[in-house]
Amino acid sequence: FGISGKHFITVTTFTSAGNIGEDGTLSCTFEPDIKLNGIVIQWLKEGIKGLVHEFKEGKDDLSQQHEMFRGRTAVFADQVVVGNASLRLKNVQLTDAGTYTCYIRTSKGKGNANLEYKTGAFSMPEINVDYNASSESLRCEAPRWFPQPTVAWASQVDQGANFSEVSNTSFELNSENVTMKVVSVLYNVTINNTYSCMIENDIAKATGDIKVTDSEVKRRSQLQLLNS
């Protein structure tokens, strides 16, 4: 926390991750102050001259905003009085990664806190039975990842087994030349078993499960952000 002036207020931030091309939120909260006109919120980014965003006297003031954030930022204006200084960030870019400072001034005092913002790409995998293959196989696809992730397969029946010899993973660059499509095929699968395709980089971990029986195919997928 940075302390200046006679009083300091508690400002809290949370490390978070942004998905390239999507919208993100940089979270920041502070001790509420019912006097909206007396609240100043400034977001700054390490290594960038100018501001990321400024909100004061009940409205935005972007006269000092750095051009890389032009048209991409907003606070949740109706939530400022209850202590929410979080920043909405439109169309997250790889270059948005870095250390941000949320600086607050209210009638009660001043305070600030830093947060680390990671950027990359992550998406849910989808597993399907590949009927075109010569033997029963599973195809795990996830449309957008960056940096390049690792892909691993697991099975409920063969716990601890290494499937690297019976799987093939490829990475195809997407049209924007940053993110990549992940495709992994697992060969020689057996019926009545649950298989998992796990995709992970330093930002996120995603898992897709598929259970194949004689009568049905059940799928489930989940995604979790790491270190946030």
């Epitope: 091309g21 935005d60 003031d61 972007l62 006269s63 051009e67 048209g71 439109k90």
Partner: antibody, heavy 121, light 107 residues
């Protein structure tokens, strides 16, 4: 409520500079929550975003027109302006000024009536 | 630049009809899409923002949906005053770009 009105010559000669002004009434363009844009529409055609300006004077121009466009703002007169240099017949269009609905939304919730500018000798 | 492709370019319909216009972005734009209505000799009017949010004062027969690359504007029951040209616009990435327009004509 805020209204926008474009003004400027309706006829410009080729190679000269097109100059338009947008005057706001019923509200202030110094409100920090908005960007102010210029958009044009060629006769019978679609819409083209030219660029925007903030009350502080910072600008962003469409790269396709960037070399020829200059925008400025005069908060004391509650006006913002567009200059487009080295015009050709292809710049003949209805020119609109508009307000972006917030600092992040980039949709246009308020428009001027538009002014037809013809480029001809 | 992000290309916005509207279809159809024109549609003939009658009062009371349900009309659907689609807009496709050349790359993902999340939900940053607006729809406008323009009548001859007039400025465009904002109908829908953020893909599905109805602009204040716009009748509820207008609705928008979609995210990513594919979006739809629906007029649930066409009224005489709805005959106009409709444009989509992406608000995701500079430079902001518009679709080519869809003219809704009287059948």
């Amino acid at each position: 409520q805020l209204q926008l009105q474009e003004s400027g010559p309706g006829l410009v000669k080729p190679s000269e500079t097109l100059s338009l002004t947008c005057t706001a009434s019923g509200g202030s363009i110094s409100h920090g929550g908005y960007y102010w844009s210029w958009i044009r529409q060629h006769p019978g055609k679609g819409l083209e975003w030219i660029g925007n300006i903030y009350y502080s004077g910072s600008t962003y121009y469409n790269p396709s027109l960037k070399s020829r466009v200059t925008m400025s703002v005069d908060t004391s007169k509650n006006q913002f302006s567009l200059k487009l240099s080295s015009v050709t017949a292809a710049d003949t269009a209805v020119y609109y000024c508009a307000r972006e609905s917030s600092t992040i939304s980039a949709d246009f919730d308020l428009w001027g009536r538009g002014t037809l500018v013809t480029v001809s000798s | 630049d992000i290309q916005m492709t509207q279809s159809p370019s024109s549609v003939s319909a009658s009062v009371g009809d349900r009309v659907t216009i689609t807009c496709r972005a050349s790359q993902g734009i999340s939900r940053w899409l607006a729809w406008y209505q323009q009548k001859p000799g007039k400025a465009p009017k904002l109908l829908i923002y953020a893909a599905s949010s109805l602009q204040s004062g716009v009748p509820s027969r207008f609705s928008g949906s979609g995210s990513g690359t594919d979006f739809t504007l629906t007029i649930s029951s066409l009224q005489p005053e709805d005959f106009a040209t409709y444009y989509c616009q992406q608000a995701h990435t500079f430079p902001y770009t518009f679709g080519g327009g869809t003219k809704v004509e009287i059948k």
